[in-house]
């Protein structure tokens, strides 16, 4: 699996999960998270070879005519696979909240 | 919807579906489909700003945060999202059969 | 390389103020939190609060009842903590510590401040 | 107000010993908690962030485990130059408490 265990413990150069630390202030220009200022939230990257850990029939029939033409720009991409959610702290008012923000850390990749 | 409704009728510049035509022969080396001898494959292609179709709470992060790290390498990619199956015809000896391939053409598209 | 050098020691009678600086080098001074402990002597770690030099916005710690107050500098990437009407068991080391990643990750050497009539 | 209890006090041990510090949060903090080494006349320097990833520069036999509100700092095997106090913080909502300290 195209993975954080795998990708971040090797070059993978292909389709994979890359390491990327978000702060929400600084990149998102948002305020209303108190906690936490950032995190990781992780992307994906890397060319999509045939075979290469492809999603549908369709990505693998993409990646057979971008093998026969080179120079095409149908090509399938990297995306995430698997996503966790984050817990977070926001305030209304002068009261602290916890939720979970659904699908916001990527853990794994595929090619779409 | 970034569907070939709006995509086919439209000069979208940003992630739609695009029309791509597929011989099986000549694009993917395939002889062993007798008919069709290709199909209206398409695909997706186009950048993902903020707010454009985006599929997830981290599609939506990630295209923040590339308004606001242009030269970023991180960013959401138009990818299909609505697939439809392609009936062919293929031989078994001398006799012909038909079946569905699912997943080989695709309706629409987003930002993932 | 990222360093945070704190002003030198200094000696306060009861009831006045005090203003501690951090100057900054080595990262984005406006795009990260900056702490502020205070240490007694022979005693743990207290967090007193922090400042985002890039807009200003702060949290305080309550113990401390409004007597910090946390400004920044943007031009000379410099962070500051005031503490005012002082008493004798605020007499104490005090670091300024830039947040990052859920932790702080560097800290200036400690500023010692006493408080003696 | 996120308390957090350290224990133990304080350690006696012998070179090339196995240390385990414990923390414990009032409350969930998932996994926003630091540990710090502190020596005498010194700043704290931080070790571990994110409850279990080693900060740069920190060598190997310092580890950290656990999430949500019991934690673990580790140190596999005690060099003479560990000899400190140690804290833990959280950064679950300021106030960011810390811990009383292990000696």
């Known amino acids: 699996a195209l993975d954080t265990n795998y990708c971040f413990s090797s070059t993978e150069k292909n389709c994979c999960v890359r390491q990327l630390y978000i702060d929400f202030r600084k990149d998102l220009g948002w305020k209303w998270i108190h906690e936490p200022k950032g995190y990781h939230a992780n992307f994906c990257l890397g060319p999509c070879p045939y075979i290469w850990s492809l999603d549908t029939q369709y990505s693998k029939v993409l990646a057979l005519y971008n093998q026969h033409n080179p120079g095409a720009s149908a090509a399938p991409c990297c995306v995430p696979q698997a996503l966790e959610p984050l817990p977070i702290v926001y305030y209304v008012g002068r009261k602290p909240k916890v939720e979970q923000l659904s699908n916001m850390i990527v853990r794994s990749c595929k090619c779409s | 919807a970034l569907d070939t409704n709006y995509c086919f009728s439209s000069t979208e510049k940003n992630c739609c579906v695009r029309q791509l035509y597929i011989d099986f022969r000549k694009d993917l080396g395939w002889k062993w489909i007798h008919e069709p001898k290709g199909y209206h494959a398409n695909f997706c292609l186009g950048p993902c700003p903020y707010i454009w179709s985006l599929d997830t709470q981290y599609s939506k992060v990630l295209a923040l945060y590339n308004q606001h790290n242009p030269g970023a390498s991180a960013a959401p990619c138009c990818v299909p999202q609505a697939l439809e199956p392609l009936p062919i015809v293929y031989y078994v000896g001398r006799k012909p059969k038909v079946e569905q391939l699912s997943n080989m053409i695709v309706r629409s598209c987003k930002c993932s | 390389e990222v360093q945070l050098v704190q002003s030198a020691a200094e000696v306060k009678k009861p009831g006045a103020s005090v203003k501690v600086s951090c100057k900054t080098s080595g990262y984005t001074f406006t795009s990260s939190w900056m702490n502020w402990v205070q240490q007694a002597p022979g005693a743990g770690l207290d967090w007193m609060g922090q400042i985002y030099p890039g807009d200003g916005d702060t949290n305080y710690n309550g113990k401390f009842k409004g007597r910090v107050t946390l400004t920044a500098d943007t031009s000379t990437s410099t962070a500051y903590m005031e503490l005012s009407s002082l008493r004798a068991e605020d007499t104490a080391v005090y670091y300024c510590?830039?947040?990052?990643?859920?932790?702080?990750?560097?800290w200036g050497q400690g500023t010692l401040v006493t408080v003696s009539s | 107000e996120i308390v957090m209890t350290q224990s133990p006090a304080s350690l006696s041990l012998s070179q090339e010993e196995k240390v385990t510090i414990t923390c414990r949060a009032s409350e969930n903090i998932y996994s926003n908690l630091a540990w710090y080494q502190q020596k005498p006349g010194q700043a704290p320097k931080l070790l571990i962030y994110a409850a279990t990833n080693l900060a740069d520069g920190v060598p190997s036999r310092f580890s950290g485990s656990g999430s949500g509100t019991d934690f673990s700092f580790t140190i596999s095997s005690l060099e003479p130059e560990d000899v400190a106090v140690y804290y833990c913080?959280?950064?679950?909502?300021?106030?960011?408490?810390f811990g009383q300290g292990t000696k």
């Open positions: 913080q959280h950064f679950w909502g300021t106030p960011y408490t």
């Open positions: 510590a830039r947040h990052y990643d859920g932790s702080t990750d560097y």
